[in-house]
Amino acid sequence: KGEQISFRDCAEVFKSGHTTNGVYTLTLPNSTEEVKAYCDMEAGGGGWTIIQRREDGSVDFQRTWKEYKVGFGNPSGEYWLGNEFVSQLTNQQRYVLKIHLKDWEGNEAYSLYEHFYLSSEELNYRIHLKGLTGTAGKISSISQPGNDFSTKDADNDKCICKCSQMLTGGWWFDACGPSNLNGMYYPQRQNTNKFNGIKWYYWKGSGYSLKGTTMMIRPAGF
């Protein structure tokens, strides 16, 4: 019986010759745990592991700590890959993070961080980011230095309020901060003056809830 080939991320999938967009099974080294992830094999040279996507409001993102830990949704549509997998993956080698955004007027923009990793669960999956470039703002809409992750049942933010309950969705809230890509999905013409929408302040300003978001990672130097 041949040895089972496993891939830790979409970059490995790409390098193995699978260069078609789609859902692939990923496994961390020294682990039997499998996750299904969407691989973007076309954008910017391919090899991108999608860790978050919003596109139509079909999936509820107001989830528990455990759900954000293991992931939820549909990898072909709206989903969250899972904080535990992303934490382990991004601590094994250096990864870049690209955040692709769409507004309701047909515009697109991105933020690219040259180094991204999540701390362990013991450290509340704190986000670490370095080296911002891109078209979605010269200032990072993810507060710097990075914050701990918060969910509706795990309040780790810096606010006297509970940001995840107030804004909906799990995120690296500050108090509450300039972004929340896991906020409430609002349809076109109902997407302004929103206190709890899908927010990326340094591109679209306050209260604007975006049409689509994708967070994707790839090893640095791919």
């Epitope: 500050d174 108090a175 300039p178 929103k194 206190f195 209260g207």
Partner: nanobody, 129 residues
Framework: EVQLVESGGGLVQPGGSLRLSCAAS????????IGWFRQAPGKEREGVSA????????YYADSVKGRFTISSDNSKNTVYLQMNSLRPEDTAVYYC??????????????????????WGQGTLVTVSS
């Protein structure tokens, strides 16, 4: 639907007065802070004053202290900005904006600009002789 509508702007001579109004709908002032901001041509938007109706707390930028007074009438769901001793440098479009009152960092009193998620369309104030 959350809406903020400013009114009361206009042309006034230096040393004169104006009262701006910000009428809120879709939420009650009790649970929110309202800020007044202004933006002069070619300049960044800047905070002028803010109020938390629930606690009666107020904030003023140094440039308007002693000249501007912010107040609220919760029965009318309206916030006012009384502007006295107006100067040419006060010329700008004035906006009101809202933020949930609880969205405060531990140990701080007021809110960064990016926390104000609901905005009005603005009212123009021109101070000129």
């Amino acid at each position: 639907e959350v809406q903020l509508v400013e009114s009361g702007g206009g042309l006034v001579q230096p040393g004169g007065s104006l009262r701006l109004s910000c009428a809120a709908s879709g939420f009650t002032l009790d649970d929110y802070a309202i800020g007044w901001f202004r933006q002069a041509p070619g300049k960044e938007r800047e905070g002028v004053s803010a109020i938390r109706s629930s606690g009666g707390s107020t904030y003023y930028a140094d440039s308007v202290k002693g000249r501007f007074t912010i107040s609220s009438d919760n029965s009318k769901n309206t916030v006012y900005l009384q502007m006295n001793s107006l100067r040419p440098e006060d010329t700008a479009v004035y906006y009101c904006a809202a933020v949930p009152a609880g969205r405060l960092r531990f140990g701080e009193q007021w809110y960064p600009l990016y926390e104000y998620d609901a905005w009005g369309q603005g009212t123009l104030v021109t101070v000129s002789s």
